[in-house]
């Protein structure tokens, strides 16, 4: 058992049949010594009297707010929040797994550029009845600050039957060095609580491998003058780190018919402008990534060819 | 260099961004067995690292480019004799059309770029690393060179802003 | 083509030392580490050690250390195994090979030791 | 020191016979093994190396399995030039060891 916040109590369990579970002391925090009694949740039914309460937790139903009492008012309230260890492995019933980019992912990272913010986001099919903490620093034996916002729900979608939440949570490194190349990575740990249910998950990453750049800005097309040629142009996004000519990108062009089966000429260029040739009902499109280290590529930006 | 001269930046910057794309080739590294993936994602903590105090940013490179020079000079340095020690020589060999060939001769030459005849004091001071066991090696390799890839980043980012602002 | 060629055989008084040569052609010396290895008339095969010949760095057999020295010529593209207060029971055929599992291996050096 | 433990230590078999040899790591070696074949005043000739990869170059009668501590060579059908020696050896750590060899004659 170890202490989540003030009051808040974690149990951990290993989650087998018949499992003997872990034998709880609990304290009321009360100069009192006498005609002390003990409640669980809502329900009035005294589970036991004195200063100490003496429990054997095994199950969910042994989880919950106990409350110490004396001549009706309440003392002090102690929640037991269970953790499961099944077969070696702590629980993850809460976070959907988001098999990319392999399995056992359950938080994904992305920055935009090499500030030190980034943001991470999760999911799970759990609508009601549940809390999440983040905490984030710096490597781990020496731990340098990382700052994390609120936790916000981001998205709702429809799968199948099922509705999916995405909740999201931005953070920033206190002291960043953009340009540093980094040692020690950062680590993620989001605290999930589904009713009395504890689970934590955990993420470690450099920046660099969880940069993804914006989308090119501004595409242009100029058409050129007697000639089935176009002269496209695009800027580096607004959000890149800078100056461009340190945090540099390269782009991947492209230009794609009205069908989707018809096979696209990816051109490759370390420059923000190129000549192409665009027919009409096609769409032009650039994506850009870091020029000098394989982190994601942008999503693409399109614009018509007419 | 060492004396204070200026590099040939657009030759660097060049070599530089051969050496990021030959490092993102070599790796993962396709030997004889597979390599799952193991350990830590730290990656090994003696190698040399770009720190902040480097004056590898844009405006230290502006105030004085040598100590980045430098800096860069002994990693080059420090690699290019990983990449030449059992770990990458001995078994599992590497296949014989692997990256990892021009990947060393390429640290080898940006190395002697920023480092003309005459100057071998880097050369000296670094040891070259102590025999390893084959069953070490493929993680090993692993982490040099996703370490390598950091590493040449960086340095492929100065080369470029001083090609592009320090240029005479 | 690729391929190690040794010195021819030796006859040695016991006490002295012998230096087999190993020539490699055919690749790039310094890309691989070379062994060495000797098996003694109708018996198995024993490792002795190995050099890597781009920074010299040597891994020997605690059997023989202090009495092996291995070293490479970068400039010749040569290995040598040195073996040192020879006896009687170093009477062995000594191999050169190339990294285990590229499979080259050079054709064996006869060391007689015999008063 | 890892120990290769080889067995038999020689059999006779006719041409055309399946022939298995085994090899055991005192210790696990993942799939850092090597067989040779040997012939009289030959050097050896490197037949599979990672425990199962075929090299270059050699017959494809000749196969290898395992992993950890138990590996075998199995020569699927004999030929009369595959009478020799053979021996295992493994290369996880040093010293790196060699089986005692398994001498294939002609019954």
């Known amino acids: 058992i170890w202490e989540l916040k003030k009051d808040v109590y974690v149990v951990e369990l290993d989650w087998y049949p018949d499992a003997p579970g872990e034998m709880v002391v609990l304290t009321c925090d009360t100069p009192e010594e006498d005609g002390i009694t003990w409640t669980l949740d809502q329900s009035g039914e005294v589970l036991g009297s004195g200063k100490t309460l003496t429990i054997q937790v095994k199950e969910f139903g042994d989880a919950g707010q106990y409350t110490c009492h004396k001549g009706g008012e309440a003392l002090s309230h102690s929640l037991l929040l269970l953790h499961k260890k099944e077969d070696g492995i702590w629980s993850t019933d809460v976070l959907k797994d988001q098999k990319e980019p392999k399995n056992k992912t359950f938080l994904r990272c992305e920055a935009k550029n090499y500030s030190g913010r980034f943001t991470c986001w999760w999911l799970t099919t759990i609508s009601t009845d549940l809390t999440f903490s983040v905490k984030s620093s710096r490597g781990s034996s020496n731990p340098q600050g990382v700052t994390c916002g609120a936790v916000t729900l981001s998205a709702e979608r429809v799968r199948g039957d099922n509705k999916e939440y995405e909740y999201s949570v931005e953070c920033q490194e206190d002291s960043a060095c953009p340009a540093a190349e980094e040692r020690l990575p950062i680590e993620v740990m989001v605290d999930a609580i589904h009713k009395l249910k504890y689970e934590n998950y955990t993420s470690s990453f450099f920046i660099r491998d969880i940069i993804k750049p914006d989308p090119p800005k501004n595409l242009q097309l100029k058409p050129l003058k007697n000639s089935r040629q176009v002269e496209v142009s695009w800027e580096y996004p607004d959000t890149w780190s800078t100056p461009h000519s340190y945090f540099s990108l390269t782009f991947c062009i492209q230009v794609q018919g009205k069908s989707k089966r018809e096979k696209k000429d990816r051109i490759f260029t370390d420059k923000t402008s190129a000549t192409v040739i665009c027919r009409k009902n096609a769409s032009f499109s650039v994506q850009a990534q870091d020029r000098y280290y394989s982190s994601s590529w942008s999503e693409w930006a399109s614009v018509p060819c007419s | 260099v060492p004396g204070g001269s200026s590099p040939a930046w657009a030759q660097c910057q060049q070599l530089s961004q051969k050496l990021c794309t030959l490092a993102w080739s070599a790796h993962p590294l396709v030997g004889h067995m597979d390599l799952r993936e193991e350990g830590d994602e730290e990656t090994t903590n003696d190698v040399p690292h770009i720190q902040c105090g480097d004056g590898c940013d844009p405006q230290g490179l502006r105030d004085n480019s040598q100590f980045c020079l430098q800096r860069i000079r002994q990693g080059l340095i420090f690699y290019e004799k990983l990449l030449g020690s059992d770990i990458f020589t001995g078994e599992p060999s590497l296949l014989p059309d692997s990256p990892v060939g021009q990947l060393h001769a390429s640290l080898l030459g940006l190395s002697q770029l920023l480092q003309p005849e005459g100057h071998h004091w880097e050369t000296q001071q670094i040891p070259s690393p102590s025999p390893s066991q084959p069953w070490q090696r493929l993680l090993l390799r692993f982490k040099i060179l996703r370490s390598l890839q950091a590493f040449v980043a960086v340095a492929a980012r100065v080369f470029a802003h001083g090609a592009a602002t320090l240029s005479p | 083509q690729v391929q190690l060629v040794q010195s021819g055989a030796e006859v040695k008084k016991p006490g002295s030392s012998v230096k087999v040569s190993c020539k490699a052609s055919?690749?790039?010396?310094?890309?691989?580490?070379m062994h060495w290895v000797r098996q003694a008339p109708g018996q198995g095969l024993e490792w002795m050690g190995y050099?890597?010949?781009?920074?010299?760095?040597?891994n020997y057999n605690e059997k023989f250390k202090g009495r092996v020295t291995i070293t490479a010529d970068k400039s010749t593209s040569t290995a040598y195994m040195e073996l040192s207060s020879l006896r009687s029971e170093d009477t062995a055929v000594y191999y050169c090979?190339?990294?285990?599992?590229?499979?080259?291996w050079g054709q064996g050096t006869t060391v007689t030791v015999s008063s | 020191d890892i120990q290769m433990t080889q067995s038999p230590s020689s059999l006779s078999a006719s041409v055309g016979d399946r022939v298995t040899i085994t090899c055991k790591a005192s210790?696990?070696?993942?799939?850092?093994l090597t067989w040779y074949q040997q012939k009289p005043g030959k050097a050896p000739k490197l037949l599979i190396y990672?425990?199962?990869s075929l090299e270059t170059g050699v017959p494809s009668r000749f196969s290898g399995s395992g992993s950890g501590t138990d590996f075998t060579l199995t020569i699927s059908s004999l030929q009369p030039e595959d009478f020799a020696t053979y021996y295992c050896?493994?290369?996880?750590?040093?010293?790196?060891?060699f089986g005692g060899g398994t001498k294939v004659e002609i019954k």
């Open positions: 090979a190339r990294n285990w599992d590229t499979g080259l």
């Open positions: 055919g690749y790039k010396f310094t890309r691989y580490v």
């Open positions: 050099i890597n010949p781009y920074n010299d760095g040597t």
């Open positions: 210790d696990h070696i993942l799939k850092f």
């Open positions: 990672g425990a199962t």
């Open positions: 050896q493994m290369y996880w750590s040093t010293p790196f060891t």
